[in-house]
């Protein structure tokens, strides 16, 4: 599985777990199907994941949600790729926007993201949604992750 | 293109094709402007790729589909990116949800689906939906394939 | 950062770009939190990627917009992701349709694009949407990018 | 909580037909192969048959080859065995089982959840 000891395979792939925090960041275990290359990419605190090298990244990210027009705010469900670099602020990389549907009790839509970007070591990307207890958390339906090329 | 004769790069991109057939599994096929890098990753039965190493690959598939809320069930649209290895069950890998249009006749609407997963030798994953009638065919709408890391 | 001299690491991430112009194609910008590799990879006349090596690319887009199902065409909503090969007419790799929203003033919805192909020297990507005056250029809503495998 | 709930069975005539259901609850069903197996009276457990995750695959005991069919409605979460052709051997507490995600499909045995069962009894 190695590309040499010098540059060893680093990916990771999680999936989403629901939470009884209030925070509008989405938490993730090592569970069913995940994947966690190695040492060198960490999910920390549940929420984000950490990489230990510098180098460029396709990060991704899937969420499914449920929700309905009349229930919801008037804004859209918007999920946030973002990234928190050692010492400095946290800033968004990636977001996606779907407006709530009318189907009732919710309407179930699914986003993705992905891109790819430069990452520090030390440097941490996690995911922000607007609501989270709209997350739909069945097999497969939401996930984040990532690969160093 | 070789990384080198141990390591061949490995990536497969495959085209939709309509069918027939009523299983709700999609069939592909190499036409169009597909990939298919070498031996070491096949499309079996116009319905899987089956890959021959094991390691960690980026699998992805794109759905784009058209339906309308009162022609369809009331569950929503569902695509699932499957994984079958040998001697196992299939097992979901990733899902998208989306809930049927008001639009009519119908409303057309995509889904991509994509992941870093671990897969054995004569590993095979598939797409599965819940209405392959309503899957949109034409050039570009939906397509599927991964690529080894 | 190098996977060696001969094989350079080869990506890129660029940003959306609001535009006067009426064309369909939509412009982007090395802007924000971008990426570009190496002059391997360039964004011409800001509105295509160009490479200059042979080889198996992974090729995304992520479009977001904001429409309305009254304001706008009957038509949906479609995002093309285009190739351009020298002393070839372009063609399709990839296309995404959603349907307008009925949401006052224009509901937003995401849509993303990826998937492997083969790319001679010169050829150039480059995204087309319906209706670029829906596109929603706000921080990481749209982006489009690529990377060598 | 997992739960799964048997129903349908009862007393039938040699040669009649019987279709036992499962009402399962408390996981994301349609991500699990599940089976039938059954007890008979003073005998040992026999798995009866399989059905993959998404209703793909199907396996069954040479026994009961033929005979019956196992089928999955993920949207109403309920797995099902249409029993034809029944025989008294075929007499039984039958019992629907959940199987780990991925499971093997030569192992029968090594199931997560079973239901309380329910008896089908062939008899003229």
């Known amino acids: 599985m190695q590309k040499g000891d010098q540059n060893p395979q680093i990916a990771a792939h999680v999936i989403s777990e629901a939470s009884s925090k209030t925070t509008s960041v989405l938490q993730w275990a090592e569970k069913g199907y995940y994947t966690m290359s190695n040492n060198l990419v960490t999910l920390e605190n549940g929420k984000q994941l950490t990489v230990k090298r510098q180098g460029l990244y396709y990060i991704y990210a899937q969420v499914t949600f449920c929700s309905n027009r009349e229930a919801s705010s008037q804004a859209p469900f918007i999920a946030s790729l973002c990234l928190k670099s050692p010492g400095r602020f946290e800033r968004i990389l990636l977001r996606a926007a779907n407006t709530h549907s009318s189907a009732k009790p919710c309407g179930q839509q699914s986003i993705h993201l992905g891109g790819v970007f430069e990452l520090q070591p030390g440097a941490s990307v996690f995911v922000n949604v607007t609501d989270p207890s709209q997350v739909s958390h069945g097999t497969g339906f939401t996930s984040f992750g990532l690969l160093k090329l | 293109m070789q990384k080198g004769d141990q390591n061949p790069q490995i990536a497969a991109h495959v085209i939709s094709e309509a069918s027939s057939k009523t299983t709700s599994v999609l069939q592909w096929a190499e036409k169009g402007y597909y990939t298919m890098s070498n031996n070491l990753v096949t499309l079996e039965n116009g319905k899987q790729l089956t890959v021959k190493r094991q390691g960690l690959y980026y699998i992805y598939a794109q759905v784009t589909f058209c339906s309308n809320r009162e022609a369809s069930s009331q569950a929503p649209f569902i695509a699932s990116l499957c994984l079958k290895s040998p001697g196992r069950f299939e097992r979901i890998l990733l899902r998208a949800a989306n809930t049927h249009s008001s639009a009519k006749p119908c409303g057309q609407q995509s889904i991509h689906l994509g992941g870093v997963f671990e897969l054995q030798p004569g590993a095979s994953v598939f797409v599965n939906v819940t209405d392959p009638s309503q899957v949109s065919h034409g050039t570009g709408f939906t397509s599927f394939g991964l690529l080894k890391l | 950062m190098q996977k060696g001299d001969q094989n350079p690491q080869i990506a890129a991430h660029v940003i959306s770009e609001a535009s006067s112009k009426t064309t369909s194609v939509l412009q982007w910008a090395e802007k924000g939190y971008y990426t570009m590799s190496n002059n391997l990879v360039t964004l011409e006349n800001g509105k295509q990627l160009t490479v200059k090596r042979q080889g198996l690319y992974y090729i995304y887009a992520q479009v977001t917009f904001c429409s309305n199902r009254e304001a706008s065409s009957q038509a949906p909503f479609i995002a093309s992701l285009c190739l351009k090969s020298p002393g070839r007419f372009e063609r399709i790799l990839l296309r995404a349709a959603n349907t307008h929203s009925s949401a006052k003033p224009c509901g937003q919805q995401s849509i993303h694009l990826g998937g492997v192909f083969e790319l001679q020297p010169g050829a150039s990507v480059f995204v087309n949407v319906t209706d670029p005056s829906q596109v929603s250029h706000g921080t990481g809503f749209t982006s489009f990018g690529l990377l060598k495998l | 909580e997992v739960q799964l709930l048997e129903s349908g069975g009862g007393l039938v005539q040699p040669g009649g037909s019987l279709r036992l259901s499962c009402a399962a609850s408390?996981?994301?069903?349609?991500?699990?192969?599940m089976s039938w197996v059954r007890q008979a009276p003073g005998k040992g457990l026999e798995w009866v048959s399989s059905i993959s995750p998404l209703g793909l695959w199907t396996y069954y005991a040479d026994s009961v080859k033929g005979r019956f069919t196992i089928s999955r409605d993920n949207s109403k979460n309920t797995l099902y065995l249409q029993m034809n052709s029944l025989r008294a051997e075929d007499t039984a507490v039958y019992y629907c089982a959940k199987l780990s995600a991925g499971a093997e499909t030569h192992v029968y045995r090594l199931f997560d959840y079973w239901g309380q069962g329910t008896l089908v009894t062939v008899s003229s």
């Open positions: 408390g996981f994301t069903f349609e991500a699990y192969p």
